[in-house]
């Protein structure tokens, strides 16, 4: 299981993971106490047939070619959590692990 | 965590799980001993902003709006395995659980 890593200078057109820092402060999301920003990453690029396909299922759907199936798209295939300190709706401070906040790998599914 | 279920008569344009039977026999995949066919399902439809987003990350990338991020696409968000009996490359019969062969839920990521 692997995925491509790119940056803003890359000429790669295929499905790739790009760096992205999410800045909660810039969004005005002040209910988030910490972190104020974190490295989230994102997926972008083309999914040619079979390239970086995560599941055998993706290949099978392509073979079966049902009505309306758009073909695979470049999407997170491995994600990880981050710890966050934030206010909930009741204005209580919560410290917890928020799942799927960081893209570790991108693939076609 | 939920997803929409549709069928061939549905008028739903949003991201939805559709029934699909994969027929290995029809593909000519005769190294698969059993099952000869199985219900695989597939995902199709539009991902309007926030609809059926699996991860908070998807929302954050939309907020940050980096170059080349295409927006979320309709993709499996929950999958399950099936047991299969098949010949491997060494012509040995293998019985095993093959992961991610059935789409249980679709979402936008």
């Amino acid at each position: 299981d692997f995925g491509l890593d790119c940056d803003e200078h890359s000429t790669e057109s295929r499905c790739c993971r790009y760096p992205l820092t999410v800045d909660f402060e810039a969004f005005g999301w002040d209910w988030i106490i910490a972190p104020k920003r974190y490295k989230a990453n994102y997926c972008s690029g083309e999914c040619e047939f079979v390239f970086l396909q995560k599941y055998p299922h993706t290949h099978l759907v392509h073979q079966a070619n049902p009505r309306g199936s758009a073909g695979p798209c470049c999407t997170p295939t491995k994600m990880s959590p981050i710890n966050m300190l934030y206010f909930n709706g009741k204005e209580q401070i919560i410290y917890g692990k928020i799942p799927a906040m960081v893209v570790d790998r991108c693939g076609c599914s | 965590d939920f997803g929409l279920d549709c069928d061939e008569h549905s008028t739903e344009s949003r991201c939805c799980r559709y029934p699909l039977t994969v027929d290995f026999e029809a593909f000519g995949w005769d190294w698969i001993i059993a099952p000869k066919r199985y219900k695989a399902n597939y995902c199709s439809g539009e991902c309007e902003f926030v609809f059926l987003q699996k991860y908070p990350h998807t929302h954050l990338v939309h907020q940050a709006n980096p170059r080349g991020s295409a927006g979320p696409c309709c993709t499996p968000t929950k999958m399950s395995p099936i047991n299969m009996l098949y010949f491997n490359g060494k012509e040995q019969i293998i019985y095993g659980k093959i992961p991610a062969m059935v789409v249980d839920r679709c979402g936008c990521s």
Partner: antibody, heavy 124, light 107 residues
């Protein structure tokens, strides 16, 4: 750059109230806890309480809870500390300080910026 | 409340000396200890956080150590500008509490 500028010195009579201001600049005021600390002449530092400007949630040292009120004005990025029923032993320099998180744990922070201090003298 | 006992309360030293100030908490504070420097008529300045991490811009002659209840601040080679009062602060539990201070004077 990040700066906290406090109001000028005050002289008050016993039993009166004082309201000290702390104007923030150079950062997003609503997203950082503001703390208040005081120091009596020739004495050590004493924590009064803190407030989160985004929602006004505050936390007080029990010693001050009955007499101190922390507030903010988001429109002017200003924090206030009001102390009522003043006594002579409230004579002190009052400081505001910003709490900066270096990590995500509830105690993963330190004071990165302080106001210059406001001397409050309580005398009859 | 957690009591913070700082020692010594005053200390005379010469330029170039290495000095150590200690802070003892009345219970385990999980390394949530900061050190401050304060000069007369000025606001305190943060030096060390989380017991041993140096605040950006603070010279490396300042160092912190310790865990549990016992913590130390060390200044490796005193310069004239280092003569000031030093305070510790525990941030493990509310209310936050400071040590009573150590006045570092020129010998």
């Amino acid at each position: 750059q990040v700066q906290l500028v406090q109001s000028g010195a005050e002289v008050k009579k016993p039993g009166a109230s004082v309201k000290v201001s702390c104007k923030a600049s150079g950062y997003s005021f609503t997203g950082y806890f503001m703390h208040w600390v005081r120091q009596a002449p020739g004495q050590g530092l004493e924590w009064i309480g803190n407030i989160y400007p985004y929602n006004g949630v505050s936390n007080y040292n029990q010693r001050f809870k009955a007499r101190a009120t922390l507030t903010v004005d988001k429109s002017t990025s200003t924090a206030y500390m009001e102390l009522r029923s003043l006594r002579s032993d409230d004579t002190a320099v009052y400081y505001c300080a910003r709490r900066y998180y270096y990590g995500t744990g509830p105690a993963d922070w330190y004071y990165d910026v302080w106001g210059q201090g406001t001397l409050v003298t309580v005398s009859s | 409340d957690i009591q913070m006992t700082q020692s010594p309360s005053s200390l005379s030293a010469s330029v170039g000396d290495r000095v150590t100030i200690t802070c003892k908490a009345s219970q385990d504070i999980n390394s949530y200890l900061s050190w401050f420097q304060q000069k007369p008529g000025k606001a305190p300045k943060s030096l060390i956080y989380r017991a041993n991490r140096l605040v950006d811009g603070v010279p490396s002659k300042f160092s912190g150590s310790g865990s549990g209840q016992d913590y130390t601040l060390t200044i490796s080679s005193l310069q004239p500008e280092d003569f000031a009062t030093y305070y510790c602060l525990q941030s493990d539990e509310f209310p936050l509490t400071f040590g009573q201070g150590t006045k570092l004077e020129i010998k």
